[in-house]
């Protein structure tokens, strides 16, 4: 029961996490900036992984997509890649984990197969969560670096000159959504891996073999010789190749407490 609960909870937590990763990836508020040197109106800029937006106090809002691929910063491309990899792995993990759920019966799927699928999905969730956390952290680092550069390189310019606009770079809502979502996916993955341990049947490394004698008190000696006590018809030590040994697959036998450890 606890295993089913752990697996189910892991699935739900991962599902929420992956939904969050998708939401964060699509959001525009990865970076937000307030322009201070604007004497007209409060201008609020925010950027996402796919487009940049401007919002003014007058209510005007405009967004423009990054239509070029090659010209964009490598760091932005890396973040995009990490988030997409996280989403893809998470989606595959969800698909696998649905079939791995103990509460869902699909044909005659054994617990060992479900355990393997649970472990696979758990690992996928962990990697997915790590990808999201890494992506968001790389972007956050890029923002911090940009902020320090923009404040350090302030200089006024006239006559064809250029100056860095004094902006306050702040972490957008998407960063926090991404961090939390990545964390949830990671936790969900760990829970799935824990559930896997409970799902796996405790099997021995050897196949249980039951021995059946043709005579009354028959034992096996090393080397495959059958020793007779004299009560049976076989009074001589005769090598038996087709002896009474049968695996459980071949002969139906009554279970013994020694059959399973």
């Amino acid at each position: 029961m606890a295993v089913t609960a752990c697996q189910g909870l892991g699935f739900v937590v991962s599902l929420i996490g992956i939904a969050g990763i998708i939401a964060a990836t699509c959001m525009d508020q990865w970076s937000t900036q307030d322009l201070y040197n604007n004497p007209v109106t409060a201008v609020f800029n925010y950027q996402g992984l796919w487009r940049s937006c401007v919002r003014e106090s007058s209510g005007f809002t405009e967004c423009r997509g990054y239509f070029t691929l090659l010209g964009l910063p490598a760091m932005l491309q890396a973040v995009r890649a990490l988030m997409i990899v996280g989403i893809v792995l998470g989606a595959i993990g969800l698909l696998v984990s649905i079939f791995a759920l103990k509460c869902i019966r699909i044909g005659s799927m054994e617990d060992s197969a479900k355990a393997n699928m649970t472990l696979t999905s758990g690992i996928m969730f962990i990697v997915s969560g790590l990808c999201a956390i890494a992506g968001v952290s790389v972007f956050a680092n890029m923002l911090v670096t940009n902020f320090w550069m923009s404040t350090a390189n302030m200089y006024t310019g006239m006559g064809g000159m250029v100056q860095t606009v004094q902006t306050r770079y702040t972490f957008g809502a998407a960063l926090f959504v991404g961090w939390v979502a990545g964390g949830l996916t990671l936790i969900g993955g760990v829970m799935m891996c824990i559930a896997c341990r409970g799902l796996a049947p405790e099997e021995t490394n050897y196949k249980a073999v039951s021995y059946h004698a043709s005579g009354h008190s028959v034992a096996y000696k090393p080397g495959g010789f059958k020793a007779s006590t004299g009560f049976g018809s076989n009074t001589k030590n005769k090598k038996i190749y087709d002896g009474g040994a049968r695996t459980e697959d071949e002969v139906q036998s009554y279970p013994s407490k020694h059959d399973y450890v």
Epitope: S31, Q33, L35, N37, N38, V40, T41, V43, N45, Q47, S52, V54, E56, S57, S58, G59, F60, T61, E62, R64, Y66, T68, G71, L72, P73, L76, M142, L143, N146, M149, S150, G157, V162, Q163, T164, V165, T167, Y169
Partner: nanobody, 122 residues
């Protein structure tokens, strides 16, 4: 390389009109606030008028009612229509734009033009 090129300046009589233009070119991603500043001989830099992407405007008190700022976002061009010009409007007019580049849309820069001279004299 981003460039802001002003044009339309020249000699005009008091009460006359001029239309200044400023064209921004280069690998620009988005231009945010654009504005006109002027520097009269022997004086400091003075704000004339500014306009946001959403067409919110602000004018210096000395030009209100006489000057009109406008922009064409699709062409990355800024205009200043100057009417009822006075002798005190004589100055070098600079174009200014807050913009970000296609290569780094996360960083904003202020670019300045070389300036165009407007002389109001009879």
């Amino acid at each position: 390389q981003v460039q802001l090129v002003e044009s339309g300046g020249g000699l005009v009589q008091p009460g006359g009109s001029l239309r200044l233009s400023c064209a921004a070119s280069g690998s620009i991603f988005m231009i945010n606030v654009m504005g006109w500043y002027r520097q009269a001989p022997g004086k400091g830099l003075e704000l004339v008028a500014v306009i946001t992407r959403g067409a919110s405007t602000n004018y210096a008190d000395s030009v209100k009612g006489r000057f009109t700022i406008s922009r064409d976002n699709s062409k990355n061009t800024l205009y200043l229509q100057m009417n009822s010009l006075r002798a005190e409007d004589t100055a070098v007019y600079y174009c200014n734009a807050d913009l970000n580049l296609a290569s780094d849309p996360f960083k904003w820069y202020t670019y300045w033009g070389q300036g165009t001279l407007v002389t109001v004299s009879s």
